[in-house]
């Protein structure tokens, strides 16, 4: 029996009965938040062999081992993961061992076993036999191995029953519990699974099988399951489903969902039966089961029941996330907010078409309308009184409509109205008339030349840069000294700069009237000598990074023909010089023969330029005398060599500090202070833990239904 699509067992341990007939859980399995310690011995689910997504255990009191619950769980496929993990065991207060002695394969994803105060038998499991890569496993904050004394079956009687493997240069027995070994297949099977009797399974089997070399006897399939057989690919006229089985068209057409988007059902795309067309594709007609590529962003039509959608906060804008066509009218009224420009762009930036009118009033937080960065058509099917389809009234800080050099906006029907926008230059409005095709529609009073732009530097002169010099973390720039008609009106200059990977920034990006600004600002006083050109040294920059820079003259609000004169430069793009890269990350070395070392690493986090090559240096080390100090024929336990694994828990370090001659006197030495790199690594580690814990809590805690 297939169960799913994901099973969430919480609060009441008797809900476990839901697993009674399950052989495959198509989806995830959550067992969590059972705070009353129960006796789980009567609960056993031997039928369950496969979980297609992930297994999550969190705060289940009284559960001491998973082996009795799931004695035959063989494969966790990890088709969908929980924060990159296919197995998560977190804060299980009473768990003493994992005990999943039949678990042979975690197909995708890593494991995270954290904060389980009583959990042992972690160092005795060789996860590399179960997972492809163990480097992303996170096993931290469990019972310290020294307190565990893990013993594999038969070790005490000197008749060890389990096989040995090497982990971190430690060759040891591998087991799940005190009486269950970790199963290993003969080397002759290679990557194939094997039966209980060590006969090799069919190549299409995964985990285990009930008979050798038989694709109908698999416990789980390496690729896909269809009509009782494990197959490398789904046969013609069948489609992949949930990453593990093949289904026909009728099956796909009849899947029912409890999600609001279900009115059109599942689709078939690229040989797979899926809930929605993937990103960049759209259904080929409303009732179609097939997808076609979108031209540009995929259309998403949003409609407002009340015809007019008022955007007065980030929350109201959130409702429009992903919308490309808005059926109705937009009324924008943003008086205040934090980081408002980028938030609005995030939620409204995909809107291309508004079928009704757009009205922006009392939006004192807005400096620009560039957050509507894809708006290209206002249809004006519904208009405001007076036949207006674009209406801009009393926006005290609005300085820019859009960057008209990179903007094509059409207003199909209706007029424009602008009044009481003191920082919006009339030239900007006239430019919009031309671009949108509304020139000639407006009557004289529709664009008020007196109360639009009366507090702005509308007739701007252009400042020209005269020189630029760069180093790895500095830029020096100079520009022509600006000379207004009356030199006393020039107060100073302001230099704006920011990182700009692409040459597409505008002055108003990320800027609002409430203090948010993506640009860094530096004030530059006038040089006392009138012949010296003004300039600045920008320091603390990143190597090999492109910056956008522009300069504005700060002038007195000197009114000339009702307008203020000002000056600013074009935006200059300039890249800092390359520098030495940071160190390569995650260096690992292993020997695969008596005369070879394989060394792997990841690129540096800060390349600081274009990496062209790596230099690998090595040297021969003298043989470690440690290896000769022990009689390997004795029955005493072989001393364990400690290897730093980068995640030493504080409570696990119990050794006393060494006593050595220090500073001429005998006495204990203090531990060396941590290097900056170590402190940073610890900080990142703590941060990563917090992020995961937040993700966990946000994912699993849900409000009670009313």
């Amino acid at each position: 029996e297939i169960c799913g699509p994901g099973i969430d067992i919480r609060n009441d341990y008797q809900q476990l009965k839901r697993l009674e007939n399950c052989t495959v859980i198509e989806g995830y399995l959550h067992i969590l938040l059972i705070s009353k310690a129960e006796d789980y011995r009567s609960y056993r689910f031997p039928k369950l062999t496969v979980i297609t997504e992930y297994l999550l255990l969190f705060r289940v009191a009284g559960l001491e081992s998973l082996g009795d619950l799931f004695p035959n769980l063989t494969v966790i496929r990890g088709w969908k993961l929980f924060y990159n993990y296919a197995l998560v065991i977190f804060e299980m207060t009473n768990l003493k061992d994992i005990g999943l002695y039949n678990l042979r394969n975690i197909t995708r994803g890593a494991i995270r076993i954290e904060k389980n105060a009583d959990l042992c038998y972690l160092s005795t499991v060789d996860w590399s036999l179960i997972l492809d890569a163990v480097s992303n496993n996170y096993i931290v904050g469990n019972k310290p191995p020294k307190e565990c004394g893990d013993l594999c079956p038969g070790t005490m009687e000197e008749k060890p029953m389990c096989e040995k493997t090497t982990i971190n240069n430690e060759y040891n027995y591998r087991c799940w519990t005190t009486n269950r070994c970790q199963k290993m297949c003969p080397s002759t099977c290679g990557k194939r699974a094997c039966t209980e009797n060590n006969e090799c399974c069919h190549p299409e089997c995964l985990g285990s099988c009930s008979a050798p070399d038989n694709d109908t006897a698999c416990v789980a399939c390496r690729h896909y399951y269809y009509a009782g057989v494990c197959v490398p690919a789904c046969p013609p006229n069948t489609y992949r489903f949930e990453g593990w089985r093949c289904v026909d068209r009728d099956f796909c057409a009849n899947i029912l969902s409890a999600e609001s988007s279900d009115s059109e059902g599942f689709v078939i795309h690229d040989g797979e039966c899926m809930q929605e067309c993937p990103s960049g594709f759209i259904r080929n007609g409303s009732q179609s089961m097939y997808c076609i590529p979108c031209e540009g962003p995929c259309p998403k039509v949003c409609e407002e029941e009340k015809k007019t959608k008022t955007i007065d906060s980030v929350t109201s804008a959130q409702m429009l996330q992903g919308c490309t066509i808005f059926k109705g009218n937009l009324l924008i009224n943003i008086r205040r907010g934090n980081n408002i420009a980028s938030e609005l762009e995030n939620f409204m930036g995909l809107i291309e078409v508004v079928t009704g009118y757009v009205k922006i009033r009392h939006s004192h937080a807005l400096v620009s309308l560039s957050f509507l960065k894809n708006l290209r058509l206002i249809l004006g099917e519904e208009q405001l009184e007076g036949n207006y389809s674009f209406y801009v009234l009393d926006n005290q800080n609005l300085q820019q409509l859009w960057d008209w050099d990179h903007r094509n906006l059409t207003i199909k029907a209706g007029k424009m109205y602008f009044a009481f926008n003191p920082k919006l230059c009339v030239s900007e409005i006239y430019r919009m008339e031309e671009v949108t095709g509304t020139k000639g529609r407006q009557s004289k009073g529709d664009i008020n030349t007196r109360n639009n732009g009366e507090r702005a530097s509308c007739e701007s002169d252009v400042l020209h840069f005269t020189s630029t010099t760069t180093s790895k973390n500095r830029i020096i720039i100079t520009w022509h000294r600006y000379r207004p008609p009356d030199y006393r009106d020039l107060i100073s200059f302001t230099v704006y700069y920011k990182e700009a990977p692409f040459k597409n920034v505008t002055e108003y990006d990320g800027q609002d009237a409430c203090g948010s600004n993506s640009w860094n600002m530096v004030d530059v006083d006038l040089p006392p000598n009138k012949d010296v050109e003004p300039g600045i040294l920008l320091h603390g920059l990143k190597p090999w990074t492109q910056y956008a820079v522009y300069v504005k003259a700060v002038t007195l609000t000197m009114v000339e023909n009702d307008h203020i004169r000002g000056a600013k430069s074009e935006i200059l793009y300039i890249r800092t010089n390359a520098s030495v890269p940071s160190i390569p990350l995650d260096v690992l070395s292993a020997s695969n023969s008596s005369s070879q070392l394989i060394v792997k690493w990841n690129p540096p986090s800060l390349p600081n330029g274009n990496l062209s090559y790596y230099i690998v240096r090595w040297q021969r080390q003298p043989q470690d005398g440690y290896l000769y100090r022990h009689n390997y024929c004795s029955k005493d336990k072989i001393p364990i060599r400690k290897y730093a694994d980068g995640t030493i828990d504080i409570e696990e370090v119990t050794e006393n500090p060494k006593t050595e001659v220090c500073g001429g006197e005998k006495g204990p030495c203090c531990a060396c202070p941590k290097t900056e790199a170590e402190k940073q690594a610890e900080k990142e580690e703590a941060e990563y833990r917090k992020v995961f814990e937040n993700f966990l809590h946000n994912s699993i805690f849900v409000p009670r239904p009313e």
């Epitope: 969430d8 029912l256 009115s263």
Partner: nanobody, 123 residues
């Protein structure tokens, strides 16, 4: 924990009609796929019909297609099964079932079940 309570069963003559209801509590009703199953005396439980969370899509077992109609009223947290042209072989205990997120064809392992209501078709 979701609770389901069926009602509306009873004795009806062949060719007659009956409307079953299933009242749900303890969960967000619209976030469950709802289904009707039935179990005739001495037989295994069999699937009758299922409906999506929004009520926009449904499917039926071949044996009831064209005679039975499944529907739901999410504002009242209630599932319905309108049974017309009833036959003697429709006699069974009818169960209402709920599953979160999704249900695939042939799927029987629903998360939540009602106690059932008996429908008897006899002259």
């Amino acid at each position: 924990e979701v609770q389901l309570v069926e009602s509306g069963g009873g004795l009806v003559q062949p060719g007659g009609s009956l409307r079953l209801s299933c009242a749900a509590s303890g969960g967000t009703f619209s976030s469950f796929v709802m289904s009707w199953f039935r179990q005739a005396p001495g037989k295994e439980r069999e699937f009758v019909s299922a409906i999506s969370g929004s009520g926009s899509r449904a499917y039926y077992a071949d044996s009831v297609k064209g005679r039975f109609t499944i529907s739901r009223d999410n504002s009242k947290n209630t599932l319905y099964l309108q049974m017309n042209s009833l036959r003697a072989e429709d006699t069974a205990v009818y169960y209402c079932a709920a599953n979160p997120r999704r249900a695939t064809p042939g799927f029987t392992q629903y998360a939540y079940w009602g106690q059932g209501t008996l429908v008897t078709v006899s002259s």
